[in-house]
Structure formats: structure tokens, C-alpha cells
Interface confidence: medium
């Protein structure tokens, strides 16, 4: 807390300018009017205030706006944003995408801080849903943003927003998140032709069910191994050797290198060994010839 001291003669700030960088903390507190600061916030970012001085400027704004800053001030916070706590930000009502962009720009190049996470949360909640423009903006600054959302939060993403998603945006998503995103992507891209569709849907396939993988195997898509390895194990297990061969095309040879890893390992255990042998890859671990395979799940469904 900065002590209240009288402003020295001739030091009263008439405007926010760079002469203030040589004011001591107590001088800033005493000589800068909070209302003046609020109306000239756009100048603060152009002045190389020290960290200590920014603390004082924040304190002045906090006193002026105890219930939270108005958006006209928030938009021009600049580096002062880095001084805000999540508690401060929870008091804000940010509705303009321009304001969001301006604040994200300040934090550019750094990992998502608790302040930024709170800001985004406030913004998205205020909008009611994660629209395309917002998603475009957020993933541009934080490629991993989508994967930081819970499945419940992702359910509010409209299919139209999926067009903004790039493959790298989904790198850290887990299967539960892809389960939510995949149906939205399927809906968003449904009018595209085969090869274009596959290019777009590929990143989301970690949420695809068996029937969609079977359908893709009929379309000569040549799925790469990296994508195959991210598929849901339960979706891969029912695929036949022929279907996997069609799905992977020339990439089928990569199965050998991945035979000890899921989902390939579990899939191998479900296939007849002589079917696996037709691939000519030396995959071992399939069901020996002559064994009867009972699909207990199917039997339960019938009874």
C-alpha cells in the first residue's frame, strides 16, 4: 500500500506522459489523478513504466473502480494487464473481441497464465458459446486452447466453429474431448467430397466410432500410422484385417513397428492369425487356426 503524501509543488500530472517514468511511487500516487489515468490509459502502454510504477497505476485504477474496470479501460490496459490477478479479472465484463485480442497480444509468446485463462472464461461465458471468430482468435494465440476445455465446455462449440480448428490445435486433446469434437466435425464437413473430407476430418478421428472407420476404409483414404495410433481402441477392435488394410493403404506396413502398442496390440489379439498372415508383415499374437471366436457382447445383446 502506497502512503498518502502531498504532491510536491509543480509535479501534478496534467497528462499521462513519459516524464512520469522518473516519478517515485509515492509521487505517482500523490500526483496522478485516477480519472485522468482512466481516460488516458491508451498512453500507458507507450511509456516504459517500471514494474513498481505499474503497481501504483493499478492501485489507482482499483480505487477508482472497486467493482471492476469498464471495458473502455480494459481495452487499453496493455502491459498493466500482466499485473491483474484472476480475482481482478472476474469482476470484468468483456464483450468485445477487440478487447480480448488486445489483452492476448500482451501475453503473446508466453504460456497461458491463470489471468488469461480467467479472461477467456469470462469472455466465452459472456458470449454464451464459443463462436467461430472467438475460436479463431483463441487458437491463433494458444494452439492448445481447445484441448484445455472440458468435454462439457466443448459441447457448447457450434459445428460451424470447427472450420477454424487446425490439426495442431488438437495435439493435446484426449479421447473424451475428441468424442465431443468428432461429431461436430463430421457435421461441419459433411458436404465435402471424399479426399477433401478426409483431410479435414483426420485430426478429429480419435473420436470416431467403428462404423465411420469402416466407411472410411471403403474410400481409399490411406490413413497414416500416426492417425491410426490415435484412434479409439474400442473403435479399432471390430475392424477386420481387410478393413484395416484398406484403411491404411500403403501405410499398412507400419503396423509391424507398432505391434506392441495400443491399439495395434489389442487389435492383433482379436484377429485370426491366418488373416494377419495375409498381410505378410510377420504380425504375431493372433487367434490360432481352429479356435472358435465367441463374440460375447453380441450374445448378450441377443439374449
Amino acid at each position: 500500500e502506497v502512503e498518502k503524501t502531498a504532491c510536491p509543488s509543480g509535479k501534478k500530472a496534467r497528462e499521462i506522459d513519459e516524464s512520469l517514468i522518473f516519478y517515485k511511487k509515492w509521487e505517482l500516487e500523490a500526483c496522478v489523478d485516477a480519472a485522468l489515468l482512466a481516460t488516458q490509459m491508451d498512453r500507458v502502454n507507450a511509456i516504459p513504466f517500471t514494474y513498481e510504477q505499474l503497481d501504483v497505476l493499478k492501485h489507482k485504477l482499483d480505487e477508482l473502480y472497486p467493482q471492476g474496470y469498464p471495458e473502455s479501460v480494459i481495452q487499453h490496459l496493455g502491459y498493466l494487464f500482466l499485473k491483474m490477478s484472476p480475482e481482478d479479472i472476474r469482476k470484468w465484463n468483456v464483450t468485445s473481441l477487440e478487447t480480448l485480442k488486445a489483452l492476448l497480444e500482451v501475453n503473446k509468446g508466453h504460456e497461458m497464465s491463470p489471468q488469461v485463462a480467467t479472461l477467456i472464461d469470462r469472455f466465452v461465458k459472456g458470449r454464451g458459446q464459443l463462436d467461430k471468430d472467438t475460436l479463431d482468435t483463441l487458437t491463433a494465440f494458444y494452439p492448445g486452447y481447445l484441448c484445455s476445455l472440458s468435454p462439457e465446455e466443448l459441447s457448447s462449440v457450434p459445428p460451424s466453429s470447427i472450420w477454424a480448428v487446425r490439426p495442431q490445435d488438437l495435439d493435446t486433446c484426449d479421447p473424451r474431448q475428441l468424442d465431443v469434437l468428432y461429431p461436430k466435425a463430421r457435421l461441419a464437413f459433411q458436404n465435402m467430397n471424399g479426399s477433401e473430407y478426409f483431410v479435414k476430418i483426420q485430426s478429429f478421428l480419435g473420436g470416431a466410432p467403428t462404423e465411420d472407420l469402416k466407411a472410411l476404409s471403403q474410400q481409399n483414404v490411406s490413413m497414416d500410422l500416426a492417425t491410426f495410433m490415435k484412434l479409439r481402441t474400442d473403435a479399432v477392435l471390430p475392424l477386420t484385417v481387410a478393413e484395416v488394410q484398406k484403411l491404411l493403404g500403403p501405410h499398412v506396413e507400419g503396423l509391424k513397428a507398432e505391434e506392441r502398442h495400443r491399439p495395434v496390440r489389442d487389435w492383433i489379439l482379436r484377429q485370426r492369425q491366418d488373416d494377419l498372415d495375409t498381410l505378410g508383415l510377420g504380425l504375431q499374437g493372433g487367434i490360432p487356426n481352429g479356435y472358435l471366436v465367441l463374440d460375447l457382447s453380441m450374445q448378450e445383446a441377443l439374449s
Partner: antibody, heavy 116, light 111 residues
Framework: EVHLVESGGGLVQPGGSLRLSCAAS????????MSWVRQAPGKGLEWVSA????????YYADSVKGRFTISRDNSKNTLYLQMNSLKTEDTAVYYC?????????WGQGTLVTVSS | QPVLTQPPSASGTPGQRVTISCSGS????????VYWYQQFPGTAPKLLIY???QRPSGVPDRFSGSKSGTSASLAISGLRSEDEADYYC????????????FGGGTKLTVL
Amino acid sequence: EVHLVESGGGLVQPGGSLRLSCAASGFTFSSYAMSWVRQAPGKGLEWVSAISGSGGSTYYADSVKGRFTISRDNSKNTLYLQMNSLKTEDTAVYYCTRGVATFDYWGQGTLVTVSS
Amino acid sequence: QPVLTQPPSASGTPGQRVTISCSGSSSNIGSNYVYWYQQFPGTAPKLLIYMNNQRPSGVPDRFSGSKSGTSASLAISGLRSEDEADYYCAARDDSLSGYVTFGGGTKLTVL
């Protein structure tokens, strides 16, 4: 890459004058306040003076106030320190540095020796 | 006489953790951020820590800063021979005459 290169140091008699220069590159010079920090032989660091980005505001340590003048030419990306009425205790390596508290980049320094 | 007080020397063996203290007053460390600089013989100082405990990019996480009241400290863990240098603390000063004030420096020797 940020570069700060000082020049103008040398041997001067007590009461004499010297002008130090610091050529800056690799950043928008006019956007940054700049400072001079000195270090007497075998001693610690001492802040000397600072100037705002436009040059409109200056600040000095008590030990040099009235004798030293800091200035800058933003068109030449150059910082200056005009030193008058030099004393033997001004003998030091003078560093040009970016900022007014967080000195994030420093020049290699130029030696000023005040001796009769 | 420096306004901030540092021990003139400190030492440690490779791998050890060494701490350098910096003591000030309410007008500097007590009410402002602390900065630490590293200086090798014959070269310019380099910013090591700013805002009490923040490291600029490129500074190893073996270096950490902290502040409590009117004192601050720099800790170096996993000491290496290349850490042998002079270390200076600094802070803005809110007293009438001060602006930025430095400690006297600590010579760190790696045994």
C-alpha cells in the same frame, strides 16, 4: 539482436570534460528509456543517469547532478553523456544500458580515467 | 557506501546450493522489486533476475530469487564452475535522493 556500443572514454585531467556516446541497434531505440551505470576499478555498480524515450525527461544521481548531462539523438540511435568538471572519483568504466530499473541489455563499457 | 548490503564473498563446491543475501530498507527493497545481475571479470553485467523472482529467457532455472520484507536473496542450486562471478542486487529507491541503488556485490567462488 540488441547491441549497445560505448565510445568516447579516455584519460582526462580533473576539471576537464568528456563526451561518451552509445550506439544502439537491434531494437526501436526511441521506445526505450536508457541509462548510464558506472563501475569504479575494483568496486561495485553505481547508477548515474537516465533519460526517457523521447529525451524529454532526465534524471541524475546526486553525485553527478549539475556536472553531467544525458541526452539522445533518436534519428541516430545514439545515447550521450556529457561529463563536465570531472573529478578523480569519476574514474570508472561507464556502461550504457537499456531501461531505467530493469537493465536488460548492457554495452561492453568505456573506461574514463580522471587523473593529473 | 552502497545502500544495499551484500556479503563481500560466498563460496561453494560444484553441485551445492549457495545463497547470496541482500539487505536494504523500507524505501528500496521494502517497497520495490529486487533485481540481480551477474558479472564476469572484464565483462558487462547481465540481468539474472527481475521483479524479485522472474528469470529472463536464457537464464537457467538453477538461479532463483526471493524477497521478504527489506531483504532479498539469490539462490544458485547445482553450482557449476562457470557460476564463479560477481553478483549484484539492485532496487529502485523511493527516498528523496535515490533512484536505482545497487548492492556492493558478492564475489562467488566455486571451490
